[in-house]
C-alpha cells in the first residue's frame, strides 16, 4: 500500500459562516517540515502556500477574501513534507450568509418559560425558500434543519435549562448560501433550581473555539524535543 | 476597484515566444495575488499560472509546467506571462485575475478565487 502522512485538520477562524463579501480565513494544521499546503474546493486544487522556513511551521491559513456563493461549499486540505503526500482532511463546510432577505424568529408559548414546557420556534421568510436553520449562539454546529414554504417550526419538545440562551435563525437557499441572521430570541428557563446556578452562559457568535491553532516551533522547542528523543534512546 | 489590462498577444509560429503583460491600476497591487487564466475556442476557462503577493511563489499547469514563467514586478504594478516552446493547443483567449486583498503567500489555482478579472488578450500559435 502507498505510504502517506497522517491527515491534517482544517478549521475555520472564527466561524465557518461568512457574510457575503467579507473575508474567510482556514486554516490547515498538519507539520513542521511539511513544504506544501493544499486547500481543495469541492474536489478541485483552490489554493497553494508554502510555509517558509517549512520545519519551523506546522501549518498555514488559506485567506477567502469577498465571500460569496461560488465559494461556498466543501474544503479540505492536505500537505506535503519532501515527496510524501497526506490523507486529506476531513470535510469543511463554509457557508456564505447575509444573502438576500432576514427571516423572522419567534418563540411559543413565549421566550420565559419553565422547566418542562413544550416549546416551538418558528422561522419565517417570505422570500422563496425551503430550508430554514435555527442555532444557538456558541453552538453554532448543531444546526436545527426544519422545511416550509414561507415558515417552519422547530419543536423543542420539554425544555430543561440547559436549552436557555439566545437563538437566531436563517433561511437558506441551498446549503452553503444562508440568509441574513434573524434577531435573537433570548429564551429563559426557569426550575431545576439546583441546576441554574450551574448553567453556563454561552459564548456569543463566533464560537469561541473556533481558532486556528498553529505554532512556530522555537529553537528551544527543538531543544527539548532533542532532548526527549535522546532520553527515550537512552531508556531504550 | 481594481482594473486589469493585458496586453502582448498575437500570431505565433509552433516553437516561438510571446510575453504577456498585465496591468494593475490601483494601490492594491502588492497586497494582490495574481494569475493567469486561458479559454480555448469551445472550451471551458482553465489556469494557466499563478503568483503569491509577496515572496512570488508560483504555481503552473502541468500542461505548461517548464515553457511559461509567471513574474511580477510589484513597482510598475504589473505582472507577466513569458511563454516559450509554444504550441497549436495553447491557442486561446489569455486573462489575468487578481485576488484582492490576499495576506500570507496564498496562491490561488481556482477561478472563483478570483474576484477581479481583465478583458483577454487572444494568442493565436498556427504554422
Known amino acids: 500500500p502507498k505510504q502517506t502522512l497522517p491527515k491534517p485538520i482544517i478549521r475555520a477562524e472564527s466561524t465557518y459562516m461568512v457574510p457575503k463579501e467579507k473575508q474567510a480565513t482556514l486554516c490547515c494544521q498538519g507539520s513542521y517540515g511539511a513544504v506544501e499546503y493544499q486547500l481543495h474546493f469541492e474536489g478541485s486544487l483552490f489554493a497553494v502556500e508554502r510555509p517558509k522556513p517549512p520545519e519551523r511551521i506546522n501549518g498555514v491559513k488559506f485567506h477567502i477574501p469577498d465571500m460569496n456563493s461560488r465559494k461556498a461549499g466543501r474544503y479540505s486540505c492536505i500537505y506535503r513534507v519532501g515527496e510524501l503526500w497526506s490523507e486529506r482532511s476531513d470535510l469543511l463546510d463554509l457557508v456564505v450568509t447575509e444573502m438576500y432577505d432576514t427571516p423572522t424568529l419567534s418563540v411559543h408559548p413565549g421566550p420565559e418559560v419553565t422547566s418542562g414546557e413544550k416549546v416551538t420556534f418558528y422561522c419565517r421568510l417570505d422570500t422563496a425558500t425551503s430550508m430554514f436553520l435555527l442555532l444557538k449562539e456558541g453552538r453554532s454546529r448543531d444546526v436545527q434543519r426544519s422545511y416550509g414554504k414561507v415558515q417552519a417550526e422547530f419543536p423543542m419538545g420539554p425544555v430543561t435549562t440547559a436549552h436557555r440562551g439566545s437563538y437566531r435563525c436563517f433561511g437558506s437557499y441551498n446549503n452553503y448560501a444562508w440568509s441574513f441572521p434573524s434577531e435573537p430570541v433570548k429564551l429563559l428557563v426557569t426550575g431545576d433550581i439546583e441546576n441554574t446556578s450551574l448553567a453556563p452562559t454561552d459564548p456569543t457568535f463566533p464560537d469561541s473555539w473556533d481558532t486556528c491553532l498553529l505554532t512556530r516551533e522555537t529553537g528551544l522547542q527543538k531543544d527539548l524535543a532533542l532532548w526527549d528523543h535522546t532520553a527515550q534512546n537512552l531508556l531504550r | 476597484e481594481v482594473q486589469l489590462v493585458e496586453s502582448g498577444g498575437g500570431e505565433v509560429q509552433p516553437g516561438g515566444s510571446l510575453r504577456l503583460s498585465c496591468a494593475a491600476s490601483g494601490r492594491t497591487f502588492a497586497s494582490a495575488a495574481m494569475g493567469w487564466f486561458r479559454q480555448a475556442p469551445g472550451k471551458e476557462r482553465e489556469f494557466v499560472a499563478a503568483i503569491s503577493r509577496s515572496v512570488g511563489d508560483t504555481y503552473y499547469a502541468d500542461s505548461v509546467k517548464g515553457r511559461f514563467t509567471i513574474s511580477r514586478d510589484n513597482a510598475k504594478n504589473t505582472v507577466y506571462l513569458q511563454m516559450s516552446s509554444l504550441r497549436a493547443e495553447d491557442t486561446a483567449v489569455y486573462y489575468c485575475?487578481?485576488?484582492?486583498?490576499?495576506?500570507?503567500?496564498?496562491?490561488?489555482?481556482?477561478?472563483?478565487?478570483?474576484?477581479?478579472w481583465g478583458q483577454g488578450t487572444l494568442v493565436t500559435v498556427k504554422p
Open positions: 485575475a487578481a485576488v484582492v486583498p490576499t495576506y500570507g503567500n496564498n496562491i490561488y489555482v481556482h477561478s472563483a478565487a478570483y474576484n477581479y
